[in-house]
Interface confidence: low
């Protein structure tokens, strides 16, 4: 069964800067990745970035740098201040659309005990939805 993992990390140098990493553990080819915060996309979440393997990347503030790390994982840097700034308990979600598995989504947030600059290793997060 395919799985999605999500890792959230706060940067030590900039307390309002977060790095989100997501990966897809499956054999299918990825056609789209959607990163959102505040909940799953389509369920109250707000889209931060959309990554298409061939046609590029679209991102919205406070997302600053979205990129592919591997063919099945992505990373996203967020920088914000004031209302647009993420906070320690913000939930980030990644949805991977793949063929032939369909869509798989998981969410994660900063581990409660995290010091800035530290984070738990990327482990599969609970799968919230499989279309």
């Amino acid at each position: 069964t395919p799985e999605v993992w999500v890792q959230v990390r706060m940067e030590a140098t900039e307390l309002s800067s977060f790095t989100i990493r997501c990966g897809f553990l499956g054999s299918g080819s990825i056609s789209l990745v959607t990163v959102s915060w505040g909940g799953p996309n389509g369920a109250g979440g707000t889209t931060l970035a959309v990554l298409h393997p061939e046609r590029g990347i679209r991102q919205w503030a406070p997302a600053r740098q979205a990129r592919w790390e591997t063919q099945s994982s992505i990373s996203l840097i967020l920088e914000g201040s004031g209302a647009s700034s993420p906070c320690a308990n913000t939930t980030f979600c990644c949805k991977f659309a793949s063929f032939p598995e369909g869509s798989w989504e998981a969410c994660g947030s900063l581990p409660p005990s995290s010091d800035p600059g530290l984070s738990a290793p990327p482990t599969p997060a609970p799968i919230l939805r499989a279309d």
């Epitope: 056609s31 789209l32 959607t34 996309n41 389509g42 889209t47 959309v50 298409h52 046609r55 590029g56 990347i57 679209r58 919205w60 503030a61 949805k95 659309a97 869509s103 279309d131």
Partner: antibody, heavy 119, light 106 residues
Framework: QVHLHQSGPELVKPGASVKISCKAS????????INWVKQRPGQGLEWIGW????????YYNEKFKGRATLTVDKSSSTAYMLLNSLTSEDSAVYFC????????????WGQGTTLTVSS | DIQMTQSPSSLSASLGGKVTITCKAS??????IAWYQHKPGKSPRLLIH???TLQAGIPSRFSGSGSGRDYSFSISNLEPEDSATYYC????????FGGGTKLEIK
Amino acid sequence: QVHLHQSGPELVKPGASVKISCKASGYTFTAYYINWVKQRPGQGLEWIGWIFPGSDSTYYNEKFKGRATLTVDKSSSTAYMLLNSLTSEDSAVYFCARDGELRGPFDYWGQGTTLTVSS
Amino acid sequence: DIQMTQSPSSLSASLGGKVTITCKASQDINKYIAWYQHKPGKSPRLLIHYTSTLQAGIPSRFSGSGSGRDYSFSISNLEPEDSATYYCLQYDNLLTFGGGTKLEIK
């Protein structure tokens, strides 16, 4: 050849809802964003939101959040926009338009659907 | 949200002449601007994207330039069929249209 064909004109009463369709042909429907754009009589163009048929991901202009709902039917390559709680301010021509590239503007447009809200 | 201030709102020009329309963004839009021609009862037509790239089939008398927050669009050798409303669209962060410029050819 890429073509977006929209449903016909609508005359509805205030407070009602309307669903406008946009049928795509000539390309892979699930690979490109469909956007919706509003134009009130004598006014400019206003972006409502987009939907990516490949994953059903949506994004709305804050102004239209809660008023517009974008959906797709992949089996018929059709995008839909539902507008609810209509007022006279919603009387306009609504266009669907396809993104040319992920970071690109709209390259193909539907012919427009005229919505008239009147009692 | 990024705001796009387009000017002028209307202008009149002579056949064979040249016009320039400007759009100013409320922040840097990294050259992600497109220009459209819109005629009454028709669908908007994409002329230029990424500041200066002509869409396929668009004649070279249409041109665009700019960077940062300031962008311009020009039409030279004006023809009668250029009478239309022209819009800029920023697509760097979400999407925002300018207010439009109505062009009349005398």
